[in-house]
Amino acid sequence: KESCDVQLYIKRQSEHSILAGRPFELECPVKYCANRPHVTWCKLNGTTCVKLEDRQTSWKEEKNISFFILHFEPVLPNDNGSYRCSANFQSNLIESHSTTLYVTDVKSASERPSKDEMASRFWA
């Protein structure tokens, strides 16, 4: 029998290269049993993760898999960065691995920078 522990399956060191100006859904796969936990998204700023309280989020249930979605409608250049989802369940806080968005401006998509360039730009 499967355990009923809540788990967040954002893939470790995952990256998404996306274009500014287009919609994007950032998925946090959430495994739970009876009671759906309270899940939030935050964006990393140095060592702290700033809660995204004013952003559109939604749940998606699909083939026995639940996702907590952070919507980007559309993606903006300053959405570049690392994100994490967190779940509150029975007084426990569970944090996911971080996932990084590399945002490319549509105008410069033909001269798309490398992930390394984007990373150095983001962490600079």
């Epitope: 522990d5 788990q7 967040l8 399956y9 893939k11 470790r12 060191q13 995952s14 990256e15 998404h16 290269s17 996306i18 994007f24 998925e27 796969p29 495994k31 699909e62 898999i65 996702f67 569970i94 691995h97």
Partner: antibody
């Protein structure tokens, strides 16, 4: 039911480029993670890399300079390209889907056998 | 890379007896608060088939004769009782860290 089917050449000459296709039915490649794995004649399994639901990719560092994984969402296919093949790339190549809840490979293609020889 | 060491490399078991296969990881497999260790069966000419996922969960359609256990660095696949149809090579796999890696395989034969 989810089904995956590999297709591509069975024989490639050294220094040439290997191109394989994985055709997916029963699920959309804009969901989950889609992988390539190979099995060498000595039975060793090697993970090659994936393309994710968003189109982002990961490659095994042992292959990074030679490998490319791309997709065509309208055809629901994804592709493996391996450059500068040698006889060491002789193997059976599999495509497989990763499950979101732990990335285990729940559906596999039957595999396609590649021989690299002049 | 995380190295998975399977033992034994081959195993001969009498029908109806228990087969135990070990998989030892070079690093702890628990960064998701979960053990992302999985077991596959591969028969000649076929692709690998998922048996056990996340250390101890039985994949749908797999007989309850198969079970998985373990945590951190030591994991075990048990087949009890062994049947003739179980002749195959068994692999462990970790998906906790990129690149994913597989064990070297254990070939199960009937004594």
């Amino acid at each position: 039911e989810v089904q995956l089917q590999e297709s591509g050449p069975s024989l490639v000459k050294p220094s040439q480029t290997l191109s394989l296709t994985c055709s997916v039915t029963g699920d959309s490649i804009t969901s989950a993670y889609w992988n390539w794995i190979r099995k060498f004649p000595g039975n060793k399994l090697e993970y090659m890399g994936y393309i994710s639901y968003s189109g982002s990719t990961y490659f095994n560092p042992s292959l990074k300079s030679r490998i490319s994984i791309t997709r065509n969402t309208s055809k629901n296919q994804y592709y493996l390209q391996l450059n500068s093949v040698t006889t060491e790339d002789t193997a059976t190549y599999y495509c497989a889907r990763s499950h979101y809840y732990g990335y285990y490979f729940d559906y596999w293609g039957h595999g396609t056998t590649l021989t690299v020889s002049s | 890379d995380i190295v998975l060491t399977q033992s034994p490399a081959s195993l001969a078991v009498s029908l109806g007896q228990r087969a135990t296969i070990s998989c030892r990881a070079s690093e702890t497999i628990d960064s998701y608060g979960d053990s992302l260790m999985h077991w596959y069966q591969q028969k000649a000419g076929q692709p690998p088939k998922l048996l056990i996922y996340r250390a101890s969960n039985l994949e749908s359609g797999i007989p309850a004769r198969f079970s998985g256990s373990g945590s951190r660095t030591d994991f075990t696949l048990t087949i009890n009782p062994v049947e003739a149809d179980d002749v195959a090579t068994y692999y462990c796999q970790q998906t906790d860290e990129d690149p994913y890696t597989f064990g070297g395989g254990t070939k199960l034969e009937i004594k």
